[in-house]
């Protein structure tokens, strides 16, 4: 219960806190468990104890082992154990699982990635951040205090993020890196009454007789996956599939496109070889979901020939 796993890389600083807490006034003694040898408190040592903290400046692979901390008060003693493992630096980019801190998940509204264990160190801004070993660049990434903020989070932002900072101890600088995975979760979806973005209600669309014309019915239905969302065209109140005019067809495929996080659908009405009688029809763009149905009506008008001036 009072044992804590800690890990670090050779030649980096590692600071470990005693798993047993006590008042700052309590003394804490540290021992190397295998030998029961006391850890010195003098800062000239590479490994030394400083109250509740055990410092490896820098760490070496041979430092791996179990360390015992005893918190001593006037009335009781509390014992804790720190299981420390120091690993050799990897030559390649991959960060092995055993060096990973807990995974954090973010969303469009909350995309903070905290640098693990940083509060144990004496560091000064700025933090450096890397994703999959590449330094993060661009205005979407902001290193703020002890965390990274990612603007407009996308699923592609998932990955392994490493923070790098400098620990200062009595004027000497030591590098520290820590890596954790970041996953992107969808915001809770919602649906709303359909909003038709195009066409405008009672829009007049100019077309040329004998030419082809396209009308796009575009509507948004909420955010996330929508159970029922559909857009379609009707001619004079009749569905295109029942209208029986082969020149006038809906484009197949109502794929959900997510713009600004909204679930939107497009349906294109293709009129081949526009005829005079097409101008007499009423074209209805319908958007339907569980909240109801919205209809926008379009009419066609003949495009006036362009005057050519010399």
């Amino acid at each position: 219960k009072f044992s804590k796993q800690s890990w670090g890389l050779e030649n980096e600083a590692l600071i470990v806190r005693c798993p047993r807490q006590g008042k700052p006034s309590y003394t804490v003694d540290w021992y190397y468990s295998q030998t029961n040898k006391s850890i010195p408190t003098q800062e000239r040592n590479r490994v030394f104890a400083s109250g509740q903290l055990l410092k490896f400046l820098p760490a070496a692979v041979a430092d791996s082992g179990i360390y015992t901390c005893i918190v001593r008060s006037p009335t009781f003693n509390r014992t804790g154990y720190a299981n420390v493992t120091i690993y050799k630096k990897q030559s390649d980019c991959n960060v092995p699982d055993y060096l990973m801190y807990s995974t954090v998940s973010g969303s469009e509204k909350n995309s903070k990635i905290y640098c693990p264990t940083i509060d144990l160190y004496n560091w000064t801004a700025p933090l450096e951040w890397f994703k999959n070993c590449q330094a993060l660049q661009g205005s979407r990434y902001r290193a703020h205090k002890s965390f990274l903020v990612i603007d407009n989070v996308m699923t592609e932002d998932a990955g392994d993020y490493t923070c790098k900072f400098i620990h200062n101890e009595n004027g000497a600088n030591y590098s520290v890196t820590a890596t954790r995975s970041f996953t992107v979760k969808d915001e809770q979806g919602f649906s709303l009454f359909p909003v038709i973005g195009a066409p405008a209600q009672n829009e007049i669309k100019e077309v040329e007789i004998g030419k082809n014309a396209n009308l796009t019915c575009s509507a948004c239905f909420g955010k996330g996956t929508q159970f029922l969302a559909a857009v379609l065209w009707q001619l004079n109140g009749t569905k295109i599939t029942d209208f029986g005019e082969p020149r006038i067809q809906q484009e197949e495929g109502q794929n959900q496109s997510f713009s600004n996080g909204l679930a939107c659908l497009d349906m294109v009405l293709r009129i081949a070889d526009v005829k005079e009688e097409d101008l007499l029809l009423q074209y209805d763009c319908l958007a339907l979901n569980l909240h109801g149905l919205r209809r926008h009506t379009v009419r066609l008008s003949r495009k006036n020939p362009i005057d050519h001036h010399s």
């Epitope: 009454f193 209600q201 559909a230 379609l232 009707q234 109140g237 009749t238 569905k239 295109i240 599939t241 029942d242 197949e252 109502q254 319908l286 339907l288 569980l290 909240h291 109801g292 149905l293 919205r294 209809r295 009506t297």
Partner: nanobody
């Protein structure tokens, strides 16, 4: 006046089939979007299937591959073919239609009286 009359409900054993019919009148059937909803005891009414046009149908995940919605414009009738029925399909099934107005909220769909489907051994 819009009228929707459901039929075809009844008691069926798990794994069995039923075909529900919805006879419509009082509106232009070929222009309407037809749907089947259901309401189990103590639960909210949920959409089961909808037919938008002869090429476009939508189904609740729980019935996909088992239920089929269709419509016959010549008979002004919508159908729900239900196969591989499960006890959890037990509910009152309602036929609904939407169309006509510029905006129609969900509560303004036209509804039938419902037909009870009981799946039990």
């Amino acid at each position: 006046e819009v009228q929707l009359v459901e039929s075809g409900g009844g008691l069926v054993q798990p794994g069995g089939s039923l075909r529900l019919s919805c006879a419509a009148s009082g509106f232009t059937f070929s222009s309407a979007i037809m749907g089947w909803f259901r309401q189990a005891p103590g639960k909210e009414r949920e959409l089961v299937a909808v037919i938008i046009d002869s090429r476009t149908t939508k189904y609740a995940d729980s019935v996909k591959g088992r239920f089929t919605i269709s419509a016959d414009n010549s008979k002004n009738t919508a159908y729900l073919q239900m196969n591989s029925l499960k006890p959890e399909d037990t509910a009152v099934y309602y036929c609904a239609a939407v169309g006509g107005a510029t905006t129609v909220t969900a509560s303004e769909w036209d509804w039938g009286q419902g037909t009870l489907v009981t799946v039990s051994s």
